[in-house]
Amino acid sequence: DTHKSEVAHRFKDLGEEHFKGLVLVAFSQYLQQCPFEEHVKLVNEVTEFAKTCVADESAENCDKSLHTLFGDKLCTVATLRETYGEMADCCAKQEPERNECFLQHKDDNPNLPPLVRPEVDVMCTAFHDNEATFLKKYLYEVARRHPYFYAPELLFFAARYKAAFAECCQAADKAACLLPKLDELRDEGKASSAKQRLKCASLQKFGDRAFKAWAVARLSQKFPKAEFAEVSKLVTDLTKVHTECCHGDLLECADDRADLAKYMCENQDSISSKLKECCDKPLLEKSHCLAEVENDEMPADLPSLAADYVESKDVCKNYAEAKDVFLGMFLYEYARRHPDYSVMLLLRLAKAYEATLEKCCAAADPHECYAKVFDEFQPLVEEPQNLVKQNCELFEQLGEYKFQNALLVRYTKKVPQVSTPTLVEVSRNLGKVGAKCCKLPEAKRMPCAEDYLSVVLNRLCVLHEKTPVSEKVTKCCTESLVNRRPCFSALELDEAYVPKAFNAETFTFHADMCTLSEKEKQVKKQTALVELVKHKPKATKEQLKGVMDNFAAFVEKCCKADDKEACFAEEGPKFVAASQAALA
């Protein structure tokens, strides 16, 4: 379905508001350091041009591809070389290489200041004075910090952001109304960004076969009543949507996502009984709702899988005829029966099944060879079950902060070369698995925990790829997507690591500690803990706990003192000396 003008086609499909929002997101994700006003100017120019193409699709340049149009526009930025260095070299390339070049320069950890939330009255005034600019600024600030954020979903977040201000700026207690909503949007936004980053990593590093396998497993769990052909169609469409978004083709992605939502709502009867309430909602909300929809009930009396996949004499014949289809059906059948398994476990089982068939279908007696294949699954299933049980028990024992500290120590000992900020960020997020998943019923714990851990560990992989420092991390990140988490779990203490020299400056604290929020205080303490482990990797957890308890006491004492700075100056060196003695 070709169009004379791609830009006109997308403008008409999406409407002006969504078109402008998506172009702003695309530009902000590519040129993450450019000022807001510059992006708004570029977006307005693109929008005016799109309107001329809507009026006359044969007008000059209207037949150009979106990559050509957008790339040409980005390359007009005057300060490209000064601001972005070698990214400016992308502009010397032709499409499609130019777009690939821009994609490669997306920065997962841009050097941008943390977003500071102004006073509620200040925000409400800004919202009322110029609502459009206020919302554009939100899209810009989120997109430049999260260059792989799922763009159509970001439009949904912006709609919720707008609704929060529209409601709360009228409220009697604006802050009480608004702040919890903004906190929720921030936390959900970070989670959404991290989940999408894993999808993009899956596509870009492991190919669309890996993503399709993930999607077959997940959609089969969600839609166990749907037939394999239906699930396959949804997987194909979903893969196209995410390939486009991860590739920077945000207009096509949003358009295709809307088409997918429309298809699902028109075919609910053959997909899931849970879609009904999603389908009554407006587009952005509907797509979000469909993506988050709960698993449908499993059909009653599903037959045993063994008949078709172990006992049948035709297993090797069926496998040889269409390997990927046969494995896809196996994965579909297994996943629809196991909403209690993580997607990553299901993919490991499919991989193990594939390896067994590859070996056994070449053997003298294939049936005899693969007869016990399901028994081989048991250890694979028990490993994440044990991991979740063990982690949840420890979380229950320690609480979130101390559980994070246990993980910080564990991961710092495994990969001490990784930067301290990365270890703190990743371990804090790994530790959040407890509050997120351990309260759930047994049947939901593993899918919650292991699939969440995969998202967090992907963040480690993405950050590490930018600045590689550990062969062990590179190995776990690149060898197998589905085995990343078990690979990290199995890492041992790095015996070759040379302890970091002691630096007193790292353990020097000031009165500004006292004005920090509870979260910021925790991050400071956890940063010190990581540095401590890097300095003394053989220290026992008991020793480290003692030092951390003393640290907390020292900070509390000085924050209660009349002259806080003097207290820190006097007590700090004592704390450092005592800590060194305790760890000697």
């Epitope: 028990e393 024992q397 000992k413 026992t540």
Partner: nanobody
Framework: QVQLVESGGGLVQAGGSLRLSCAAS????????MGWFRQAPGKERVFVAT???????YYADSVKGRFTISRDHAKNTVYLQMNNLKPEDTAVYYC????????????????WGQGTQVTVSS
């Protein structure tokens, strides 16, 4: 000073049983995970079994159904009942403890005993 002292090792015929004990001292261990690793000649130390502060148990696949780990919180002691022993179970068995006990790798455990030899003859 934390100490873990194993006992109960020895020579046994294949198919026989042994019960290992590990007495912990130097502090209270009621919140610790405690367990057992083993090391066969020329091999790495490998996980055998562990028991959490809540008395949840975890076993290596190779010993599941044959070995049982248990603990007595009051006595700061952990036990390993080994039934239907096989020649491949021959190893030095080490008692371990850790205040967090997260994981199944040797480096996940801070405290180790000296080990007790178990030899299974065929």
């Amino acid at each position: 000073q934390v100490q873990l002292v194993e006992s109960g090792g020895g020579l046994v015929q294949a198919g026989g049983s042994l019960r290992l004990s590990c007495a912990a001292s130097g502090r209270t261990f009621s919140n610790d995970a405690m367990g057992w690793f083993r090391q066969a000649p020329g091999k790495e130390r490998v996980f055998v079994a562990t028991i959490s502060w809540k008395s949840s148990t975890y076993y290596a696949d190779s010993v599941k159904g044959r070995f049982t780990i248990s603990r007595d919180h009051a006595k700061n002691t952990v036990y390993l009942q080994m039934n239907n022993l096989k020649p491949e179970d021959t190893a030095v068995y080490y008692c371990v403890a850790d205040p967090y006990g997260l994981g199944f790798n040797p480096s996940d455990y801070d405290y180790w005993g000296q080990g007790t030899q178990v030899t299974v003859s065929s």
